[in-house]
């Protein structure tokens, strides 16, 4: 007959499981419940995946692992506190008098409920890693945390290599025994202990759950340390950098922590499991019943099979681990789960030229000398596209790519960004906004949606801001509709006339050269170099200024570079920036200084691209530690990450203009990194590549 095999992880749990099985059988609950003994939750998950057991209750972290690695699904959830339903919230608490925010946690003193505990460790550490605030090299989360905070109390961390830092704030019991124990001997253990660590001034932030402050303040019956505490003297840290009252935990938290849930194989009927357990809880969840599902007192332990605080079990509608965990918790787990034993010893970097091979070799040696992990290996390829193929084929792991290549890498090869480059603000040549500039003209004002029939000025055919982005954007928005992939003809028919300088004018529509003026003698009209006075971004703006065109597609710096006395050439000497405006995608016009909010797209910085199964946090963790040593172009550590002058090349491995490598944060896909506008423009152009 049909039976459900529950997996127990300890002798007391096996004992309780046997009693539950007997109680269910006696009550005639079907199907039969059997008990299988596993050695741990992880072992039980393996037994279930191998069809040697069927069900177990897991916490959030284990649900993540079981779902991601073994395809198990949650089917029944625990409910605790009626107000919060099947979850509670992990929060970061600070004293109201302090100035700490989520962005200023580096260097502050931290209080944790215990090592590897959900709200005290897993969520805050995972969140800090996932959001890019905390970089972890070589999966050594303990080292990263001990370097990040200015001392902590993490009960249970005494056995680790970093106990000096992670146990620095712990105090043990009144006689100094049990310092840093993961037990009540340590006064700063558990939720109330971590809060006490904050309240007594040992730490600056406590990672606890949403109810902790309210349960330990305002004269609740408490031990002496808490009797004078007021909840209003504490605040929560929100993820956006603000702070909130301790009652605002629904809006201001690090993550909603999902309740424990019963997981089974994907082919198991979740409804069947719920019906079995529902019958059980109907009969065996109230006091005085012969067997109590939600109590472990009789077995001398806590939380056996189910959490003792469970008030009821409920069916899970969307039976996927992602849906049950929720995106906040899921993200935190992504940041945390890094198994040093499964971390590849090498990160294979794709190189494209002899100078790049030389620089990469030096980088590998320099990193190895400083014991940076994983070690770099250099693998050559013929082109960026060849790199993408080799990364997809798992022959290489990483390469730095430009915007258009990032698009191809993501769309065609499924690669994702692991870290990005960041340039100095002055550096308008490496990351910039594409803008549509017009004269400020109240009587003949038009918007981006009304460009048909206007005269247009472009830097040149194929230039990113002058052609690719604006034309791609107009195609994507449905204004320009090429027939038979003939973009040139479509553009020439969309605008009344244009100047789009070009190098190879064969079969080039004449209207795309109609506004061009050539050199001072009227020769070299429409050529793709500076002999054409309307060539380049400066030339396209001049085309607008001299009233040849109605709109110029340029970089966000172009207007500033050629107005307010910044360009002394006669055509520009008297120009004022305030006489020009930008056309915005939403149909509005804006001041030229509003380029960040009113642009056709931002040309994105380069990014390091990897396979989606690569742990991006270890890649950024490596680069972040490396740039501390080698990122400054004047460092004395024997290698310069962001300088190629020693190799007679430019932009090798990284752009030389890079000031630092940055985490991707929420931009975890190629679309996220590139931005919707840039992607739309590229899609507009690529839709025409027949």
């Amino acid at each position: 007959g049909m039976e459900v095999r529950w997996c127990a992880t300890s002798d007391p749990e096996q004992h309780k499981c046997g009693n539950m099985s007997e109680a269910f059988r006696e009550a005639g609950i079907q199907p039969s419940l059997l008990c299988v003994r596993g050695t741990s939750a992880d072992h039980c998950v393996q037994l279930i995946a191998a069809q040697e057991a069927d069900a177990i209750t897991l916490d959030g972290g284990a649900i993540y692992e079981a779902g991601k690695e073994h395809g198990l699904k949650p089917v029944v959830g625990e409910v605790y506190d009626q107000e919060v339903g099947t979850s509670y919230y992990a929060v970061a608490v600070v004293r109201r008098s302090s100035h700490v925010t989520i962005d200023t946690l580096k260097g502050v003193k931290s209080c944790h409920t215990g090592i590897n505990r959900t709200v005290g460790w897993n969520v805050p550490v995972g969140y800090l890693v996932e959001s890019g605030r905390l970089s972890v090299m070589g999966c050594d989360v303990l080292k990263a945390v001990s370097d990040y905070f200015g001392g902590s109390c993490v009960p249970g961390a005494g056995e680790t290599s970093y106990s000096e830092s992670l146990c620095r704030l712990c105090r043990g019991d009144s006689s100094g025994e049990g310092v840093c124990d993961k037990s009540p001997l340590e006064r700063y253990y558990d939720y109330s202990g971590a809060f006490r660590c904050l309240a007594e001034g040992a730490g600056d932030v406590a990672f606890v759950k949403h109810s902790t402050v309210l349960e330990n303040t305002d004269g609740k019956t408490l031990p002496s340390w808490g009797q004078a505490l007021l909840s209003q003297d504490f605040e929560l840290l929100c993820r956006d950098g603000s702070r909130a009252d301790v009652t605002e935990w629904r809006q201001c938290h690090l993550a909603r922590v999902p309740a424990h849930a019963v997981v089974v194989r994907a082919d198991t009927d979740g409804g069947l499991i719920f019906r079995l357990l529902n019958e059980g809880q109907r009969l065996f969840s109230h006091e005085g019943s012969s067997f109590q599902m939600f109590s472990s007192e009789a077995y001398g332990q806590k939380d056996l099979l189910f959490k003792d605080s469970t008030s009821e079990l409920v069916p899970i509608a969307t039976q996927t681990y992602e849906a049950w965990l929720g995106h906040e918790y899921l993200h935190a787990m992504k940041g945390l789960l890094c198994d040093p034993n499964r971390l590849p010893p090498y990160l294979r970097w794709c190189v494209l030229s002899t100078p790049e091979i030389q620089k990469c070799g030096d980088m590998a040696v320099a990193f190895r000398r400083q014991r940076l992990k994983p070690e770099i290996q250099c693998v050559s390829a013929k082109s960026p596209q060849h790199c993408m193929e080799r990364i997809q084929a798992e022959q290489v792991d990483a390469v730095t790519l430009s915007g258009e290549d990032i698009y191809t890498a993501g769309k065609t090869y499924g690669l994702v960004p692991a870290a990005g480059e960041h340039y100095a603000p002055e550096d308008s040549s490496n990351s910039y906004y594409v803008v549509a500039v017009v004269r400020r003209d109240s009587s003949h004002a038009f918007t981006l949606d009304e460009l048909r029939g206007k005269r247009s000025c472009h830097a040149g055919f194929g230039s990113p801001a002058g052609w690719d982005v604006p034309v791609g954007a107009l195609i994507q928005r449905g204004f320009i509709r090429p027939k038979d992939c003939d973009v040139l003809t479509a553009v020439s028919e969309f605008f009344n006339a244009s100047c789009v300088p070009v190098n190879n004018p064969k079969n080039y529509p004449s209207s795309l050269c109609a506004l061009c003026v050539g050199d001072e003698q009227g020769r070299n009209k429409c050529v793709g170099n500076s002999q054409e006075r309307y060539y380049g971004y400066r030339g396209a703006f001049r085309c607008l200024v001299e009233n040849a065109g109605d709109v110029a597609f340029v970089r966000h710096t172009t207007v500033f570079d050629n107005t307010n006395g910044h360009n002394s050439e006669p055509w520009a000497a008297e120009l004022r920036s305030e006489d020009y405006e930008l056309l915005c995608p939403n149909g509005a016009r804006a001041e030229v200084s509003q380029f960040a909010a009113c642009n056709l797209a931002q040309i994105p910085p380069h990014a390091v691209m990897v396979r989606p199964d690569t742990n991006i946090f270890t890649v950024y963790g490596l680069l972040d530690k490396a740039q501390d040593l080698f990122g400054d172009d004047h460092n004395k550590n024997g290698f310069k990450m962001f300088d190629s002058s020693n190799y007679h090349g430019q932009d090798l491995l990284f752009k030389d203009a890079t000031v630092r490598a940055v985490p991707v944060g929420e931009k975890t896909t190629y679309r996220g990194w590139l931005g919707l506008d840039y992607v739309a423009a590229l899609e507009g152009m690529s839709s025409q590549q027949c």
């Epitope: 002055e426 308008s428 966000h556 500033f560 380029f595 940055v662």
Partner: antibody
Framework: EVQLQESGPSLVKPSQTLSLTCSVT????????WNWIRQFPGNKLEYMGY???????YYNPSLKSRISITRDTSKNQYYLQLNFVTAEDTATYYC?????????????WGQGTSVTVSS | DFVMTQTPLSLPVSLGDQASISCRAS???????????LHWYLQKPGQSPKLLIY???NRFSGVPDRFSGSGSGTDFTLKISRVEAEDLGVYFC?????????FGGGTKLEIK
């Protein structure tokens, strides 16, 4: 009119953390680059770092291991934290803005706050 | 770092005189994008520095036209055509072509 105002303790003990706030009015810190500069006794100016409109930070490598610049956009404030201070960190600390309009020169400065590191 | 050297250290002038301050960079300040990010600031006694000139020769709004900047590559000059009492203070040049931005040591303009 853009105005920046530094605030924070004027005396910090050696090995402790120096924490300063820059409150901005007349402009939003979600636009442009927001900087910290310090001036030592004897007038020498040192650029410390910035936080950009998108939240990215850059730190002068000479301070990299000790400095943190953060912001709270809801308050239109940004912050400087300098850890493990010594007497050498005694200086007047300025916050300042950089935007494209002046090609990222520092066009508006706070009035400065003097910080002494001493036990 | 890129070293900015200002001369003279102190410049005594009479009101109405022309004053000239020199600033030399240890390497060229021409950025790969063609711009030269050399700026001048004035710090009056008891005040914070104020921007005078940006990108070599552009006067910031409200700066009188008696101030002018010139130069290229590594050598730059700030000129004050007719010194007035309100011009007294310490003048700093600064570059932001290379990171981190750096400042000159300052030139003190004082009454003779």
């Amino acid at each position: 009119e853009v105005q920046l105002q530094e605030s924070g303790p004027s005396l910090v003990k050696p090995s402790q953390t120096l924490s300063l706030t820059c409150s901005v009015t007349g402009d939003s810190i979600t636009s442009g680059y927001w900087n910290w500069i310090r001036q030592f006794p004897g007038n020498k100016l040192e650029y410390m770092g910035y936080i950009s409109d998108s939240g990215i930070t850059y730190y002068n490598p000479s301070l990299k291991s000790r400095i943190s610049i953060t912001r709270d956009t809801s308050k239109n404030q940004y912050y400087l934290q300098l850890n493990f201070v010594t007497a050498e960190d005694t200086a007047t600390y300025y916050c300042a803005r950089r935007t494209l309009a002046t090609y990222y020169a520092m066009d508006y400065w706070g009035q400065g706050t003097s910080v002494t590191v001493s036990s | 770092d890129f070293v900015m050297t200002q001369t003279p250290l102190s410049l005594p002038v009479s009101l109405g005189d022309q004053a000239s301050i020199s600033c030399r960079a240890s390497q060229s300040l021409v950025h790969s994008n063609g711009n030269t990010y050399l700026h001048w600031y004035l710090q009056k006694p008891g005040q914070s520095p104020k921007l005078l000139i940006y990108r070599v020769s552009n006067r910031f709004s409200g700066v009188p036209d008696r101030f002018s900047g010139s130069g290229s590559g590594t050598d730059f000059t700030l000129k004050i055509s007719r010194v007035e009492a309100e011009d007294l203070g310490v003048y700093f040049c600064s570059q932001s072509t290379h990171v981190p931005p750096t400042f000159g040591g300052g030139t003190k303009l004082e009454i003779k």
